[in-house]
Interface confidence: low
C-alpha cells in the first residue's frame, strides 16, 4: 500500500513539476526590467526565451519573437536546450510511469517490469528536474552578472562626470516557476525511485518448487492469477510543447500595429 502511495504521489508531483517546466519555458517573464530609480515615462521591458515584450504604463503590450537562431547569445541557446531536454525527458518519463503505476494493470506485466519502468521514469524525472534547475540557474546567473555590470559607474571623458545606467534586469516570474517546477520534478523522480525498491520482487521470497507426480514433471511457480483491470492505455500524441521561435505571421495581433512603434 505504501509503495503504491509513494509511486502515485511521485507521479502526481512529477506531473505538476513538468507542467511547471513547460509553463516556465513558454513564459515571457524570464527577465524583467528592474524599476528601481527608473524614469516615470520609461517603458517596461521583459524578456523570455522565445520573445521580448515591451509594455507601456497603460497596459499596451507588444511582443516580438526572436526570429534568428544564429544571432542569439550562446547562453540563451543553452538555456533553451536545457529546458527542452527537461520537457522531453519529463514527457517520456510521464508516459513510462503511467504504465508503471501499480494501480494500473496492462496485460500480464510482471512486477519486475513495473519496477524497472518505475526506476526508468524516476531517473528521467530526476534528470528532467536537474535540466530545468540548471537552465533557470544559468539564466539567473547571466542576469546577476549583467545586473551588477549595469549598475557600475561609467565615467565620461568630460570632467570625470559619473553616470549610472538606470535600467537593469532582474529575476522574472518564470525563473521562480522554473526552480519550483524543477524541484518538484526532482522530488517526484526520487519518490519514483524509492517506490521502485518496494515494487521489485524479492528473489528469496519463493523458489521454484518441482512436484513429481505420476511420472509427469510439473514445474510450479507461484505467482497466481493476474487480472487485467481493463484500463485502455490512452497514448494519443498530445502536443506537449510548442515553444519554438515564432514566425512573423504567428506573432499575436494587437489592437493596432500603430499602438506602439
Amino acid at each position: 500500500m505504501a509503495v503504491t502511495a509513494c509511486q502515485g504521489l511521485g507521479f502526481v508531483v512529477s506531473l505538476i513539476g513538468i507542467a511547471g517546466i513547460i509553463a516556465a519555458t513558454c513564459m515571457d517573464q524570464w527577465s524583467t526590467q528592474d524599476l528601481y530609480n527608473n524614469p516615470v515615462t520609461a517603458v517596461f521591458n521583459y524578456q523570455g526565451l522565445w520573445r521580448s515584450c515591451v509594455r507601456e504604463s497603460s497596459g499596451f503590450t507588444e511582443c516580438r519573437g526572436y526570429f534568428t537562431l544564429l544571432g542569439l547569445p550562446a547562453m540563451l541557446q543553452a538555456v533553451r536546450a536545457l529546458m527542452i531536454v527537461g520537457i522531453v525527458l519529463g514527457a517520456i518519463g510521464l508516459l513510462v510511469s503511467i504504465f508503471a503505476l501499480k494501480c494500473i494493470r496492462i496485460g500480464s506485466m510482471e512486477d519486475s517490469a513495473k519496477a524497472n519502468m518505475t526506476l526508468t521514469s524516476g531517473i528521467m524525472f530526476i534528470v528532467s528536474g536537474l535540466c530545468a534547475i540548471a537552465g533557470v540557474s544559468v539564466f539567473a546567473n547571466m542576469l546577476v552578472t549583467n545586473f551588477w555590470m549595469s549598475t557600475a559607474n561609467m565615467y565620461t571623458g568630460m570632467g570625470g562626470m559619473v553616470q549610472t545606467v538606470q535600467t537593469r534586469y532582474t529575476f522574472g516570474a518564470a525563473l521562480f516557476v522554473g526552480w519550483v517546477a524543477g524541484g518538484l520534478t526532482l522530488i517526484g523522480g526520487v519518490m519514483m525511485c524509492i517506490a521502485c525498491r518496494g515494487l521489485a520482487p524479492e528473489e528469496t521470497n519463493y523458489k521454484a518448487v518441482s512436484y513429481h507426480a505420476s511420472g509427469h514433471s510439473v514445474a510450479y511457480k507461484p505467482g497466481g492469477f493476474k487480472a487485467s483491470t481493463g484500463f485502455g492505455s490512452n497514448t494519443k500524441n498530445k502536443k506537449i510543447y510548442d515553444g519554438g521561435a515564432r514566425t512573423e505571421d504567428e506573432v499575436q495581433s494587437y489592437p493596432s500595429k500603430h499602438d506602439y512603434v
Epitope: 526590467q33 524614469p39 516615470v40 515615462t41 520609461a42 517603458v43 521591458n45 521580448s52 515591451v54 507601456e56 504604463s57 497603460s58 499596451f60 507588444e62 516580438r64 549595469s150 561609467m154 553616470q163 549610472t164 545606467v165 538606470q166 535600467t167 493596432s256 500603430h258 499602438d259 506602439y260 512603434v261
Partner: antibody, heavy 119, light 110 residues
Amino acid sequence: QVQLVQSGAEVKKPGSSVKVSCKASGGTFSSYAISWVRQAPGQGLEWMGGIIPIFGTANYAQKFQGRVTITADESTSTAYMELSSLRSEDTAVYYCARGFIRYGVFDYWGQGTLVTVSS
Amino acid sequence: QSVLTQPPSASGTPGQRVTISCSGSSSNIGSNTVNWYQQLPGTAPKLLIYSNNQRPSGVPDRFSGSKSGTSASLAISGLQSEDEADYYCAAWDDRFHHVVFGGGTKLTVL
C-alpha cells in the same frame, strides 16, 4: 542621466537626402522608443516617426510616409533618421526624443540638428 | 495647420497666474492623455506635464495640468521671468495613428 547626442548641422541641396544620427548613453537603449520631431524656423513641433530598437520596426506620420526612414543600431546605441527628396520646406531643426510614442510623452531630448535645404 | 489648437501668445506679470489652453477633438484629447512641453529660447523642448496632470521629477509644482472633454489647459502660478518660453501640448491621435502637437504658445513675462 540619460543623454541623446545628435550629429552636426547639415546643408543639403533640394532632391538630395540627409541622415541624422542620435547616440544614446546612460540607459538601456533597446527598450525605449526613439522618436524624431522636427521644428521649422519660427514654427511648432511636428512628430515624424519613431522606433523601438529592440523590435526594429518603425512607425511614421502619414505626412512623411515613404520619404523618411528611421533605423536603430543596438550595438552602438544609435538611432538614425533619413529624409529623402528634400525640399526647401524641410529646412528645420530635427530632434530625437526618447519615451512613449503611443502617448506623446518624450522625457529626454537630443540637442537638435539643423538641416538647411538650399540650392 | 496644427491638429491641436493653442493661442499663439500669452502674457503675465511676475507672481501672476497664467493659463494656456489646448483644444483638440474626440480622436486626440477626447480619448487620450495630454502632455505639455516647455521650450526655452534656443533649446530643445522639455517635458513639463504628462498624462494630463503628472509632473516629472524636477518640475516645480507651480506648473499644473488639467483636461476636460476635448480641451486641456496648463496653469502656471507664481509666474517667474524664467518661465518665458514656448509651450506645446501633445497627444496621440487615434485617427492619424501618430502623435500630434499644438501650434505652440509664446509666453511673455512682462
